[in-house]
Interface confidence: low
Amino acid sequence: MEPRAVADALETGEEDAVTEALRSFNREHSQSFTFDDAQQEDRKRLAKLLVSVLEQGLSPKHRVTWLQTIRILSRDRSCLDSFASRQSLHALACYADIAISEEPIPQPPDMDVLLESLKCLCNLVLSSPTAQMLAAEARLVVRLAERVGLYRKRSYPHEVQFFDLRLLFLLTALRTDVRQQLFQELHGVRLLTDALELTLGVAPKENPLVILPAQETERAMEILKVLFNITYDSVKREVDEEDAALYRYLGTLLRHCVMADAAGDRTEEFHGHTVNLLGNLPLKCLDVLLALELHEGSLEFMGVNMDVINALLAFLEKRLHQTHRLKECVAPVLSVLTECARMHRPARKFLKAQVLPPLRDVRTRPEVGDLLRNKLVRLMTHLDTDVKRVAAEFLFVLCSESVPRFIKYTGYGNAAGLLAARGLMAGGRPEGQYSEDEDTDTEEYREAKASINPVTGRVEEKPPNPMEGMTEEQKEHEAMKLVNMFDKLSR
Amino acid sequence: MGCTLSAEDKAAVERSKMIDRNLREDGEKAAREVKLLLLGAGESGKSTIVKQMKIIHEAGYSEEECKQYKAVVYSNTIQSIIAIIRAMGRLKIDFGDAARADDARQLFVLAGAAEEGFMTAELAGVIKRLWKDSGVQACFNRSREYQLNDSAAYYLNDLDRIAQPNYIPTQQDVLRTRVKTTGIVETHFTFKDLHFKMFDVGGQRSERKKWIHCFEGVTAIIFCVALSDYDLVLAEDEEMNRMHESMKLFDSICNNKWFTDTSIILFLNKKDLFEEKIKKSPLTICYPEYAGSNTYEEAAAYIQCQFEDLNKRKDTKEIYTHFTCATDTKNVQFVFDAVTDVIIKNNLKDCGLF
């Protein structure tokens, strides 16, 4: 049914005809996400009519139908202004049972109505800056947070929980004031850590789940995203012991997430959100990643369970296959691994053994090949200085921040970027701060060492002298040609 | 039958191994000597690399050394504001407040009379008022049309601190100073068993013998280019834009017979300035044929290709390109701040409508 016909039906006001028109429109457009310009004015007119009824109150019998129509039109940018008013937002918040001024609805809310209103709010907040501002002013986050805290006590359908969390994500992603509010005033980290534990269905001592079901995966990812939003600009501060304990507890849950698979093909995405959040944990809390007890079948190194570190390394390998979104794909996991390696000798030695094993192939340049080392060395000359810096920093820490060792594994040419940024082009401190980390040379390396060009990091025969056979005079003449060029350049 | 060695035989074998090892070590010593040539135009960020080495390698500049830079900081600051005022005349830009014209006249008088290494409160006041003027700021924003030291804003924004009578330049202030380098500055440093000799080549013609010794057996050339030079307008005496000038030299050096097997480390410096500029000044100013977008990634990649494509020996000669921001010596406790915004933006992008 065309929007004009629906609007006409609304204006006549005959209830059954209106409901039928709305239903027909909803059926036809349930999957419409782009709209023809030709009918734009009709849709705007329909939106205005819907808003006026919405603000006066929808009849209980047909609320879901009306809200579905509002949801469909809230996908249309040209209708956003109609819906993004204080009254409309308040009405939708009331139906979603998250309006702050209302007493909670005494009788149990109609979950279908609640769900439709949440979806409308998600669409509006995603697309309209005005709606974002009004939602922040209306403090919708307060009642949303309250409801998330009730999930343990009352059973809400998966979809309601998912859209509660999605709306929380949108509000915290788009509004710094809401972020602060949830973080400080509403104790968001504790609240959402608790919700994450509930969703994962684990107590920290248990073995990780083998596979997280689809619905739990969806909710867990929304929680991880909200936690990311509220912690990224807050945990750079020093944390006290009480907070540290909370973040460590969150760390144990994230450890579970890293080790668990997600239903469908969503494991990598699930791990991605987990790793992003790990990057926001205060550095001193990352030790939980190495605190898993050893058990049958776990990967042990120097008496420490390396399952989590190994899983992060596997995740990095997978991410390095990607060509787009490289920065946000690899920087978080690299920086988490870097910090683990910086602070924990067993982790550093394990990672070095995996990523920078003793050199054997000294005939190939370090950036050539498909080993993890080769891929990371390639990133050291990446156009994006953030990507380049995380990759170089990771390898540098694996070399115990020893410049000679770093050059040995990557070549001075590749290393020059980090060394310049760190002011270490000429060596810096004589050795890294990890003096107890020795480096083993293979027989192949020792044999070839004299022929390795430190700049390229591979064996190269001594080239013939291009000036062979020239007289001193001729050499001077050639040299002066170069000098004149340099002179021109430095003027 | 088993093969056994007499005591003398064993000793002889050991001696022979020892001689081999000594020979190998001598060979290694020679082989492990790395000769670097540091090249780059006046404002390419080349001298910053040398200064950074000093800062970290030799525990930084001592307070005494920093004090010696005070005069350079003052001179750089005064020269910067003078360059802007002069350019206002050329670009026909008026002061926002007419009273600043008196300050400008006063600036030339006071600057001429200033004692080296000192800045009077009167001179500091004049510079501060001028720098705040909207006309001066408008002219500063057009600095690509005249020659202006990159550190102008750094010093002028910090005038209150710099003009204090007891001012001692910080390491960062020293990094920002600009002094014309001449001749060859040789730096030696050792990484364990690697002995590096770096020759920072200024443009002065000293005895020829010294030059030859400089160019023979070079392991790598460090070539510095200021990315932010791409949009600088030619001064009257210049034949080509500074970026093209750098490319021309890079071409000559990269393919020069002295450097047939010499790797090149190409530092594309001042990426921070470039990132700011590219939003306002299109890359076509420098490369009219460029058809990409004016985003940092695409434009920077294009410049990188322009330089790397000059290498005529791609199979045997390596070019290692690094995008750098030469004044960043902060040894960051590594967190991925730079990435968080991108993560949130992408998470938002992935939120479809319902």
Epitope: T34, H324 | D350, G352, F354
Partner: nanobody
Framework: QVQLVESGGGLVQAGGSLRLSCEAS????????MGWFRRVSGKEREFVAA????????YYADSVKGRFTISRDNSKNTVYVQMNGLKPEDTAVYYC???????????????????WGQGTQVTVSS
């Protein structure tokens, strides 16, 4: 930029089969989620099927589930949709589309695709 060109449309009897192809040029399409949409004149464009960058996951509209199969060959930069058991209501212009959005979003909601082909006509006669 990715340029998309569809081919393989035509006239077919109800119950018959067709295989549409979509070749991508420009940037490598292997990092894109690819999809097929269709439009009956005067109606909204309707989602048909989508496939993730590696080809390991697919997703279909209810109306074509079990009859249509989407696949891709990244070495040829080509995406296919095999349409069996065609019905008159499948008559439409079929468009190929590409997006860099994450695949799961396409399953949970209907996102905008970034790049579109010109379309190829499929007519199913009864």
């Amino acid at each position: 930029q990715v340029q998309l060109v569809e081919s393989g449309g035509g006239l077919v009897q109800a119950g018959g089969s067709l295989r549409l192809s979509c070749e991508a040029s420009g940037r490598t399409s292997s990092s894109y989620v690819m999809g097929w949409f269709r439009r009956v004149s005067g109606k909204e464009r309707e989602f048909v099927a989508a496939i993730n960058p590696t080809g390991s996951s697919t997703y279909y509209a209810d109306s074509v589930k079990g009859r249509f199969t989407i696949s891709r060959d990244n070495s040829k930069n080509t995406v296919y949709v095999q349409m069996n058991g065609l019905k008159p209501e499948d008559t439409a212009v079929y468009y190929c589309a590409a997006t860099r959005r994450d695949f799961y979003i396409i399953r949970n909601s209907r996102p905008q695709f970034d790049y579109w082909g010109q379309g190829t006509q499929v007519t199913v006669s009864s």
